[in-house]
């Protein structure tokens, strides 16, 4: 089961016993699969295994990416999953953990030309669930070494949105991925309806900013399913 | 100040339904994923299930599945837990977290970093 697979998942933020933000745990920790934190004048304890489903790798933090955890099983959901070390196996630059990048499936070191010249790479992307399949279309491009220590403008090459600069998002834009900005209120969106149908885009939206979310425009609710047109909106 | 606030708990026979809710207020963020987990006496708090920032990827602990329902509301800022076929061992408190982000920030490992108080839900057989 999903559980069973994930069980040794890394130790996600902890609840603080009566609400407000999680800081630190606190210094108790205990063996798993139980965590300490403390409850009023006592100690309690919260299970170790906190997935957190993700539709995109920008949902998940930096050292992680968006998959699916098992290949059969639990079709459609995805969860955030620890970043891979150099030398193993990936499918994509966002598997690779912070200064790694995708190379023929291995994650290997972004700095190993010294950041000279320019990084070949090759770019899998497939479309329909991408984590789950080395088939894809290939298409090699060239990738500016200056990302990796600058922060991206709008139009660099990315691989993930922390490359990019504030306001902007790392998106797909045909087979490679670019910083473009995130979305502004009344822009329009892209709500994802069926699980992993944000892998057909080829021309993918950044997210809506902070205080916005992706809505149907309101003029536009008695018209057909396929046709709504989503934009972002207030809360 | 951010709160949230959980509703709906209270006591129910085994076999009955119950819908959760929590209401996050306060707070300039962007809500990410939001979950539910609940404790049970003497026990590890344990997840229940969790839905993604856009609402695409759901997760269920598989003691409930095919019994329980997430589902977010983002205009009203409220994730919902819609409990049926609920048995004994369902008995414990429930609390609703979710991960606020300000706008461009990303931690190294996302995680739920705001919780509520809990409200409680005891299946009685």
């Known amino acids: 089961t999903l559980n069973s697979v994930l069980n040794s998942n890394a130790i996600k933020n902890l609840p603080p016993p009566l609400g407000g933000a999680a800081g630190h745990p606190g210094s108790a920790v205990s063996a798993a699969p139980g965590i300490l934190y403390p409850g009023g004048n006592k100690y309690q304890t919260i299970d170790n295994y906190q997935p957190y489903p993700c539709a995109e790798d920008e949902e998940c933090g930096t050292d992680e990416y968006c998959a699916s955890p098992t290949r059969g099983g639990d079709a459609g959901v995805q969860i955030c999953l620890a970043c891979r070390k150099r030398r193993k196996r990936c499918m994509r630059h966002a598997m690779c953990c912070p200064g790694n990048y995708c190379k023929n499936g291995i994650c290997v070191s972004s700095d190993q030309n010294h950041f000279r010249g320019e990084i070949e790479e090759t770019i899998t992307e497939s479309f329909g669930n991408d984590h789950s399949t080395l088939d894809g279309y290939s298409r090699r491009t060239t990738l500016s070494s200056k990302m990796y220590h600058t922060k991206g403008q709008e139009g660099s090459v990315c691989l993930r949105s922390s490359d990019c600069a504030s306001g902007l998002c790392c998106a797909r834009h045909f087979w490679s991925k670019i910083c473009k900005p995130v979305l502004k209120e009344g822009q329009v969106c892209t709500k994802h309806r069926r699980k992993g149908s944000h892998g057909l885009e080829i021309f993918q939206r950044c997210y809506c900013g902070e205080g916005l979310s992706c809505r149907i425009q309101k003029d536009h609710h008695q018209a057909s399913n396929s046709s709504r047109l989503h934009t972002c909106q207030r809360h | 100040e951010v709160q949230l606030v959980e509703s709906g708990g209270g006591l129910v026979q085994a076999g009955g339904s119950l819908r959760l809710s929590c209401v996050v207020s306060?707070?300039?963020?962007?809500?990410?994923?939001m979950g539910w987990f609940r404790q049970a006496p003497g026990k590890l708090r344990e997840i229940v299930a969790a839905i993604s920032r856009t609402g695409s990827s759901i997760y269920y602990a598989d003691s409930v599945k095919g019994r329980f329902t997430i589902s977010r509301d983002d205009a009203k800022k409220t994730v919902y837990l819609q409990m049926n076929s609920l048995k004994s061992e369902d008995t414990a408190v429930y609390y609703c977290?979710?991960?606020?982000?300000?706008?461009?920030?990303?931690?190294?490992?996302?995680?739920?970093?705001?919780w509520g108080q809990g409200t409680q839900v005891t299946v009685s057989s």
């Open positions: 977290a979710v991960d606020g982000r300000a706008n461009g920030e990303r931690p190294a490992v996302a995680g739920y970093n705001y």
């Open positions: 306060g707070g300039t963020f962007n809500v990410y994923a």
